[in-house]
């Protein structure tokens, strides 16, 4: 008996071939001997089966002795043994229809779980193997689960169902809703304007939801809500903004926030959350702000940084075009009685300068100038 695998919703063509290459009488029946379709001369006739409106044949092939049964919009319950009667002989074809569906929506939030469920006919014992867009293989029976979806899991998942040494392939498009970056860090000199951007890693026709930026300043005892906003069809409208700092927000995607000036009291880390309509859970992006200040008070030249710096970052003070006078893995460095000239304060990571602030030290009888 020939086995054919089909996919729910698809069309399958079961073949039946006569030895004579001409149009002769044939008919297809199911295992209950109920006629599905056949011919009367050059006319297609249909029987009282449940497939009535979904069954067809290919008249153009009858003259070549081919009498296929075409079943459209396959259902799991179409799984059966189909019999083709032609020239006093019977050809049996076993059709097994499978369906593979994602648990709920194919648009899932980062960190959520994806469950793929296999629908299969009674008596079958298929195995399933799925390959994610990033090449990860998962295997299972009736259900396959992937927890903690990541951004790289967005794309086409290819799943192969194996039964009786035959296989059928499903392709499911999964969209992982996330920000492009889980975390970002902005380095700024005191007084500079700060731009925070929160680009999304997906595109959808209509995007509606609401968001909030919570901020934990290094100097503050508590985290504060800095801004709340609504998103309607990709248009951003601010609901509430804190008095200090006076943040500004762009009206279009990507989500964009501007802090008029970087100040030590703002240095810290924030968490932007976005709740999307009809989705449980929220999207998160962490953002960090590091602020540098170089000052000269009397005979002391000081450079300080505030905010979340890694312990391996180096803070240095150097006179332009000279070796660093002081260099430490600390958040403040200073030079007593600095000589006149342009001093540079540098925050660097393995030699790469992340932030630089210049301060001009004048001869002792005058006051310093900050360029």
């Amino acid at each position: 008996k020939k086995v054919v695998l089909g996919k729910k919703g698809d069309t399958v063509e079961l073949t039946c071939t006569a030895s004579q290459k001409k149009s002769i009488q044939f008919h297809w029946k199911n295992s209950n001997q109920i006629k599905i379709l056949g011919n009367q001369g050059s006319f297609l006739t249909k029987g009282p089966s449940k497939l009535n409106d979904r069954a067809d044949s290919r008249r153009s092939l009858w003259d070549q002795g081919n009498f296929p049964l075409i079943i459209k919009n396959l259902k799991i319950e179409d799984s059966d043994t189909y019999i083709c009667e032609v020239e006093d002989q019977k050809e049996e074809v076993q059709l097994l229809v499978f369906g593979l569906t994602a648990n709920s929506d194919t648009h899932l939030l980062q960190g959520q779980s994806l469950t793929l469920t296999l629908e299969s006919p009674p008596g079958s014992s298929p195995s399933v193997q799925c390959r994610s867009p990033r090449g990860k293989n998962i295997q299972g029976g009736k259900t396959l689960s992937v927890s903690q979806l990541e951004l790289q899991d967005s794309g086409t998942w290819t799943c192969t169902v194996l039964q009786n040494q035959k296989k059928v392939e499903f392709k499911i498009d999964i969209v992982v809703l996330a920000f492009q970056k889980a975390s970002s860090i902005v380095y700024k000199k005191e007084g500079e304007q700060v731009e925070f951007s929160f680009p999304l890693a997906f595109t959808v026709e209509k995007l509606t939801g609401s968001g909030e930026l919570w901020w934990q300043a290094e100097r503050a005892s508590s985290s504060k809500s800095w801004i709340t906003f609504d998103l309607k069809n990709k248009e951003v409208s601010v609901k509430r903004v804190t008095q200090d700092p006076k943040l500004q927000m762009g009206k279009k995607l990507p989500l964009h926030l501007t802090l008029p000036q970087a100040l030590p009291q703002y240095a810290g880390s924030g968490n932007l959350t976005l709740a999307l309509e009809a989705k449980t859970g929220k999207l998160h992006q962490e953002v960090n702000l590091v602020v540098m200040r170089a000052t000269q008070l009397q005979k002391n030249l000081t450079c300080e940084v505030w905010g979340p710096t890694s312990p391996k970052l180096m803070l240095s003070l150097k006179l332009e075009n000279k070796e660093a006078k002081v260099s430490k893995r600390e958040k403040a460095v200073w030079v007593l009685n600095p000589e006149a000239g342009m001093w540079q304060c540098l925050l660097s990571d393995s030699g790469q300068v992340l932030l630089e602030s210049n301060i001009k030290v004048l001869p002792t009888w005058s006051t310093p100038v900050q360029p």
Partner: antibody, heavy 119, light 107 residues
Framework: QVQLVESGGGVVQPGRSLRLSCTAS????????IHWVRQAPGKGLEWVTI????????YYADSVKGRFAISRDNSKNTLYLQMNSLRAEDTAVYYC????????????WGQGTLVTVSS | AIQMTQSPSSLSASVGDRVTITCRAS??????LGWYQQKPGKAPNLLIY???NLQSGVPSRFSGSGSGTDFTLTISSLQPEDFATYYC?????????FGQGTKVEIK
């Protein structure tokens, strides 16, 4: 909704110790610094102490420095005030308070617990 | 510690009166000041934050002004429920410090 409930007050002799608790609910305790403020009978408000959201920093009023210790257990959503070497002038209603989400004002207060230091 | 001097310590006024309470800081605290109302047997209630911003849910007859060292709380038209004690609190530095309070009584 935000709730702060103080407990542990009572009558204690001078020189003895007492521990107050403040149990929080209705908000993410781990994100907030919490203050203790006191008020002696018929007198004004006096700020006592604060502990940072993560317990990393603590500040005290000069009048209690070295005698009082603030602490927190974020897993229990509870704030503590350990009061040692108590004096008659420590007699007061003790409030725990939390800042607003949008500003530095003390927007949420407990109902207070009375501590009486008397022999 | 920063000293906060509040005046007057008490005042008598009638319903509909305009009432002004002042608070002076011993050093510059920018606009880091809040005003609180307290009724007998109750916890204080935040009225004004950052010197001049009305806390959500507080009637608009309350207003605050000032910056640096001198600050004012104004009640434009005193209502029966406004008879209470008012305190300023500096949140510029630790230790935080309150003013001594101003008791607003019915004339």
């Amino acid at each position: 909704q935000v709730q702060l409930v103080e407990s542990g007050g009572g009558v204690v002799q001078p020189g003895r110790s007492l521990r107050l608790s403040c149990t929080a609910s209705g908000f993410n305790f781990i994100n907030y610094g919490i203050h203790w403020v006191r008020q002696a009978p018929g007198k004004g408000l006096e700020w006592v102490t604060i502990i940072w959201y993560d317990g990393s920093k603590k500040y005290y009023a000069d009048s209690v420095k070295g005698r009082f210790a603030i602490s927190r257990d974020n897993s229990k959503n509870t704030l503590y005030l350990q009061m040692n070497s108590l004096r008659a002038e420590d007699t007061a209603v003790y409030y725990c308070a939390r800042e607003d989400d949008w500003n530095d004002g003390l927007a949420y207060w407990g109902q207070g617990t009375l501590v009486t230091v008397s022999s | 510690a920063i000293q906060m001097t509040q005046s007057p310590s008490s005042l008598s006024a009638s319903v509909g009166d305009r009432v002004t309470i002042t608070c002076r800081a011993s050093q510059d605290i920018r606009n880091d000041l809040g005003w609180y109302q307290q009724k007998p047997g109750k916890a204080p209630n935040l009225l004004i934050y950052a010197a001049s911003n009305l806390q959500s849910g507080v009637p608009s007859r309350f207003s605050g002004s000032g910056s640096g060292t001198d600050f004012t709380l104004t009640i434009s038209s005193l209502q029966p429920e406004d008879f209470a004690t008012y305190y300023c609190l500096q949140d510029s530095n630790y230790p935080r410090t309150f003013g001594q309070g101003t008791k607003v009584e019915i004339k």
